[in-house]
């Protein structure tokens, strides 16, 4: 499947997951906390204030770094998986905190968490794609 299609599919799946999670958690527009979101890179489930959400590195970085192997689980397609199985000390794990002011930025930032060889990538630009 073309990489553009993969990410359109991932985005669509993300919106479905968020909707299901909102129903499970009793979230609505006026609920305190952080709404689930697709940040154009990966999917983030809804969270309560004070909650840290962990995700494994998104598909984008498997395309950037095809040789990179992560020890962490890939989050399931049908739901958000078990965040408890992920650990921030693992390579390939990114977190966001839900604060009173909304979502924090990813920690670490995606490149630091997921690895990126900018020199190797110089040659592979014809395979590169844009997220829409």
């Amino acid at each position: 499947m073309h990489s553009d299609c993969i990410f359109k599919k991932e985005q669509a799946m993300c919106l479905e997951k968020i909707q299901r999670a909102n129903e499970l958690m009793g979230f609505n527009d006026s609920s305190p906390g952080c709404p689930g979101m697709w940040d154009n890179i990966t999917c983030w489930k809804p969270a309560h204030v004070g909650e840290m959400v962990l995700v494994s590195c998104p598909e984008l970085f498997r395309i950037f770094n095809p040789d990179q192997v992560w020890e962490t689980e890939t989050i399931g397609e049908s739901d958000f998986g078990d965040s408890n199985s992920l650990d921030l000390s693992d390579m390939g794990v990114v977190s966001r905190n839900c604060t009173e002011d909304g979502w924090s930025e990813p920690f670490p930032h995606y490149f630091d968490a997921c690895g990126f060889d900018e020199y190797e990538s110089e040659t592979g630009d014809q395979d590169y794609y844009y997220l829409s």
């Epitope: 940040d39 154009n40 890179i41 930025e105 930032h109 995606y110 630091d112 990126f116 110089e122 630009d125």
Partner: antibody
Framework: QVQLVESGGGVVQPGRSLRLSCAAS????????MHWVRQAPGKGLEWVAV????????YYAESVKGRFTISRDNSKNTLYLQMNSLRAEDTALFYC?????????????WGQGTLVTVSS | EIVLTQSPATLSLSPGERATLSCRAS??????LHWYQQKPGQAPRLLIK???QSLSGIPARFSGSGSGTDFTLTISSLEPEDFAVYYC?????????FGPGTKVDIK
């Protein structure tokens, strides 16, 4: 090596517009977020805006929101800052910087800056 | 927005002395705090990322520590080229912010 060269600065009257450019080379521009940071004469650094690698995410400092627009042309390896309704307090050296990330990141390489002077 | 406060505003020291610079955030930024050095007429240079992670090409005399709201940049033994302004920067919450800077000058 990473090179960032800003241009487009100059003297402009309050209320007028200016567009800054930043030409990037030495790295795969289309894979990195990019920032604008400014520094008023004799003052500290002020973060202005950031754009994600594909232009899909843009964020601004409150002081410029609604007046400044960050954009990029990945085919030209160029970052832009469109500045409208300029004020005297916008007078500063404007730096473009690479964000070490696809989304936002922290600035890791900086240009030498272009000076914008807003004065009547 | 998160406000970063740096102290002292100016630090007057002699070459060979130890410099300790502080950065305090108005709310937790976790470890998403980075340090930059700026010399007159030059662009800033990234020194330390994520509070304590060193970068290649940066002398080992520069080190960082802290998490949450309190951070420290330490220069173990000042070299003549270290006299400059140092800024902390948080990339934890948008809008991103910089501290006002600490100027390290020669005593």
């Amino acid at each position: 090596q990473v090179q960032l060269v800003e241009s487009g600065g100059g003297v402009v009257q309050p209320g007028r517009s200016l567009r800054l450019s930043c030409a990037a080379s030495g790295f795969t521009f289309s894979r990195f977020a990019m920032h604008w940071v400014r520094q008023a004469p004799g003052k500290g650094l002020e973060w202005v805006a950031v754009i994600s690698y594909d232009g899909g995410n843009k964020y601004y400092a409150e002081s410029v929101k609604g007046r400044f627009t960050i954009s990029r042309d990945n085919s030209k390896n160029t970052l832009y800052l469109q500045m409208n309704s300029l004020r005297a307090e916008d007078t500063a050296l404007f730096y473009c910087a690479r964000g070490y990330d696809v989304l936002t990141g922290y600035p890791d390489y900086w240009g030498q800056g272009t000076l914008v002077t807003v004065s009547s | 927005e998160i406000v970063l406060t740096q102290s002292p505003a100016t630090l007057s020291l002699s070459p060979g002395e130890r410099a300790t610079l502080s950065c305090r955030a108005s709310q937790s930024v976790g470890r998403s705090l980075h340090w930059y050095q700026q010399k007159p007429g030059q662009a800033p240079r990234l020194l330390i990322k994520y509070a304590s992670q060193s970068l290649s090409g940066i002398p080992a005399r520069f080190s960082g520590s802290g998490s949450g709201t309190d951070f420290t940049l330490t220069i173990s033994s000042l070299e003549p080229e270290d006299f400059a302004v140092y800024y902390c920067h948080q990339s934890s919450m948008l809008p991103f912010t910089f501290g006002p800077g600490t100027k390290v000058d020669i005593k």
